[in-house]
Interface confidence: medium
Amino acid sequence: AQEVQQSPHCTIAPVGGSVNITCSTSGELHGIYLRQLGPQPQNIIYYEDRVVPTTDKRFQGRIDFSGSQDNLTITMHHLQPSDTGTYTCQAVTEINVYGSGTLVLVTEEQSQGLHRCSDAPPTGSALPVPPTTSALPALPTASALPALPTASALP
């Protein structure tokens, strides 16, 4: 069965800091969305092997990728308090499959000690209702998916 493993469950970062979210998927896959949950869930990125990634304007210049679509690490830089929230990986397949979510807490330096992450994933109630297919971009057929891009993560 299609499955999305997402890590970490929770991460704390200072204002201006960075976080990594990893989405690992088994089975056939068109691409990966990272969505920020909330009253109006918002797509942050869409990543597909070999295809130029798409990034929401609010995160322009603040996102890096490493790996490939089935084992993708998304790095968000220059974090702001408004970036606090739960982010979930959405695997775009014949049906949409979701990761368990990552709670990102962006804190001011002085309040860092007040926050703790538990080992439990964010509550399932925070997960969005899967969007309708019409809300997704047109996707190529699996046979048309090209090879992995030449992307190197610098130290």
Partner: antibody
């Protein structure tokens, strides 16, 4: 006004090295992906390499992979292209270009706007 | 890689004429296609992005259309400053690729 000024071009022998620089001004350099595009004399445009805003992710065209290295220094608002093992076919005007800025769901590396004036690299013995 | 084929290679026209330039793509790029103008001795300039959106400061006589694999750039009425080379470019897939260009020259 956005300005991109390339430098570092010149005549170099095959197998030699050059480092191109692109000094940026008029925008928040650290928020934009940047690219190098080249144009051989009398020929069309060829994308060479791109780098993400943070500098952590880089992309290369196959003909330059393993020979060219793109990098950036956000504190100096400068983009670089280190070119090693140069070949005659690398002779071209090299342009640096900034990501276009527009306020819809936009590409991580998108359209080139604006471009610098270019710097000529000639590889010849 | 995605190959972009522009036609014709050269167009000889007079000011005031309507121009239609073609860019055919080897596989679908959705709407991720742009057009650039380059004059002799100058850097290229972005005209149209995402198939049909005019870049900042570009006159309304320039328009783009198409989708998938067939795209056109139309200049409704040629001005003297429009004689130049025009390139299309896709950003759907790596590597980013350009067409070979169409030169619009004065008849």
């Amino acid at each position: 006004e956005v300005q991109l000024v390339e430098s570092g071009g010149g005549l170099v022998q095959p197998g030699g090295s050059l480092r191109l620089s692109c000094a940026a001004s008029g925008f928040t350099f650290s928020r934009y992906a940047m690219s190098w595009v080249r144009q051989a004399p009398g020929k069309g445009l060829e994308w060479v390499s791109s780098i993400s805003a943070s500098g952590a992710t880089t992309f290369y065209a196959d003909p330059v992979k393993g020979r060219f290295t793109i990098s950036r220094d956000n504190s100096k608002k400068t983009l670089y292209l280190q070119m090693n093992s140069l070949r005659a076919e690398d002779t071209a005007v090299y342009y640096c270009a900034k990501d276009q800025d527009f306020d819809i769901l936009t590409g991580y590396l998108n359209w080139f706007d604006p471009w610098g004036q270019g710097t000529l690299v000639t590889v010849s013995s | 890689e995605i190959v972009l084929t522009q036609s014709p290679a050269t167009l000889s026209l007079s000011p005031g004429e309507r121009v239609i330039l073609s860019c055919r793509v080897s596989q679908s790029v959705s709407s991720y296609l742009a057009w650039y103008q380059q004059k002799p001795g100058q850097a290229p300039r972005l005209l149209i992005y995402d198939t049909s959106n005019r870049a900042t400061g570009i006159p309304a006589r320039f328009s783009g259309s198409g989708s998938g694999t067939d795209f056109t750039l139309t200049i409704s009425s040629l001005e003297p400053e429009d004689f130049a080379v025009y390139y299309c470019q896709q950003r759907r897939n790596w590597p980013l690729t350009f067409g070979g260009g169409t030169k619009v020259e004065i008849k």
